[in-house]
């Protein structure tokens, strides 16, 4: 007789979970020398071990200490990009400009990215079919605790000038619920940053506005600023030749604003 | 080229009021934060207000019941209105642009015009 | 308000010197400090902010350092251009508060 089973409103666990995280760590820790130490088998014991056999809805930032200690990695911390809303342009930004790094360059990012997981409370069991969704379910869900947590420790070590890429295009181009706007922006320390700048993103191609006038972006701008944190804005009118830039910055066409 | 201009500076006998104007070119007071600087003759510099983009205002607590800052984003003018003027208010007053949007340091600054308070 | 102290208030040295002006805060101020040049009758000119960034178009011979409460401002080889008054300011709280200035001129 099948077990009864919790049906929830999100998708279930992404198909060979177990196998993509560990197969993503032993890449990972190939390409980067500085992470070669870690031992992947213990990684992915410390993943499952945050929400296996754990009620999917109870899920808190100490259940993923063990793992955060084993993927405990120091990148440079004046070289931090944010983003919201805009993962695929912030990726491309950093293949290109490889001193600089969004929370997917770093292992625990890496593993986790575009993945979802959950248990059940009192089995064993990967729960495949469904997992709680953020808004209909649950906030304390196994993937939204495990974004809060990394994202948190990501935003506390940076320093100098944090960069965050914006997406010009959404109706709210910095909004409070995202994870930057609810967890990122809040655990950046004033004590180690200087200045937050926003790059904001243009969708179109004869889109000439300034977006850094945007409401959200002066709220941004509010937030940052009542924490002793500069804030500077910018317009990226033309992603496409922004990247071509960053690519090759010596281009005669780069002088002008991109 | 940015440019910052002030002007309203004079001679002003104690308890009166002035107004100071800072006119700038080659950058928008909507992207930019403003602050008024003074110097009194021969001494060091005291920052005095800001004003940042979007209007809302910063002072120095020894100012703040006798000073406004204000600004006219349409004619590129950011204003120091000084009440109750006294012989220590004599110095130099800088307006200066914020070096980024929302920056506390001050990276082009006007040549001052010199407020003389004596009766 | 946060007090800057700098010192020296004057110095008189050779071109080509190496000049370094301190500046002390009563308080950690994370580096929240930028340097300023005045030459007579002039406005004050942002020379290095954050402690040890130096602006676009300055020259290299000035350099800064410092972290904590203590910060170091340094002209590694003095020039006749040089002569002036250097003041450091920190942002790190309003009122943003300026040292008193260290006056340098050429023995």
């Known amino acids: 007789v099948p077990r009864w089973r919790q049906q929830w409103s999100g998708p279930g666990t992404t198909k060979r979970f177990p196998e993509t995280v560990l197969a993503r760590c032993v890449k990972y820790t190939e390409i980067h020398p500085e992470m070669r130490h870690v031992d992947c088998q213990s990684v992915w014991d410390a993943f499952k071990g945050a929400f296996i056999s754990k009620h999917p809805c109870n899920i808190t930032e100490e259940d993923y200490q063990p793992l955060m200690k084993l993927g405990t990695q120091t990148v440079p911390c004046n070289k931090i990009l944010l983003w919201s809303r805009i993962k695929d342009l912030a990726h491309q930004f950093t293949q290109v400009q490889r001193d600089m790094f969004t929370l997917e360059d770093t292992l625990l990012g890496y593993l986790a990215d575009d993945l979802t997981w959950c248990g059940e409370f009192n089995t064993s069991k990967i729960n495949y079919q469904s997992c709680p969704d953020w808004r209909k379910d649950c906030s304390n869900n196994p993937v939204s605790v495990f974004w809060k947590t990394v994202s948190r420790r990501f935003a506390e070590a940076a320093c100098d000038v944090v960069h965050v890429m914006l997406n010009g295009s959404r109706s709210k181009i910095f909004d409070k619920n995202s994870t930057f706007g609810s967890v990122e922006v809040h655990n950046l320390q004033p004590e180690k940053v200087q200045t937050l700048e926003a790059w904001v993103i243009h969708g179109g191609r004869e889109d000439s506005r300034d977006l850094c006038q945007d409401p959200t972006i002066k709220e941004l701008e509010s937030i940052i600023s009542k924490r002793n944190i500069q804030f500077s804005c910018k317009n990226i009118y033309r992603p496409d030749k922004f990247l071509q830039c960053v690519k090759n910055p010596e281009d005669s066409s780069c002088t002008s604003e991109i | 080229e940015v440019q910052l201009v002030e002007s309203g500076g004079g001679v002003v006998q104690p308890g009166r009021s002035l107004r100071l104007s800072c006119a700038v070119s080659g950058f928008s007071l909507l992207s930019y934060g403003v602050h008024w600087v003074r110097q009194a003759p021969g001494k060091g510099l005291e920052w005095v207000a800001v004003?940042?983009?979007?209007?809302?205002?910063d002072y120095n607590a020894a100012f703040m019941s006798r000073f406004t800052i204000s600004k006219d984003n349409s004619k590129s003018t950011v204003y120091l209105q000084m009440n109750s003027l006294r012989a220590e208010d004599t110095a130099v007053y800088y307006c200066?642009?914020?070096?980024?949007?929302?920056?506390?340091?001050?990276?082009?600054w006007g040549q001052g015009t010199l407020v003389t308070v004596s009766s | 308000d946060i007090q800057m102290t700098q010192s020296p208030s004057s110095l008189s040295a050779s071109v080509g010197d190496r000049v370094t002006i301190t500046c002390k805060a009563s308080?950690?101020?994370?580096?929240?400090l930028a340097w300023y040049q005045q030459k007579p009758g002039k406005a004050p000119k942002l020379l290095i902010s954050?402690?040890?960034s130096l602006e676009t178009g300055v020259p290299s011979r000035f350099s800064g350092s410092g972290s904590g409460k203590d910060y170091t401002f340094t002209i590694s080889s003095l020039q006749p251009e040089d002569v002036a008054t250097y003041y450091c300011q920190q942002f790190w709280n309003t009122p943003w508060t300026f040292g008193q200035g260290t006056k340098v001129e050429i023995k």
């Open positions: 954050g402690a040890t």
């Open positions: 004003i940042w983009r979007g209007g809302s205002a």
């Open positions: 200066a642009k914020s070096m980024i949007t929302t920056g506390f340091t001050l990276d082009y």
């Open positions: 308080e950690d101020i994370y580096n929240r």
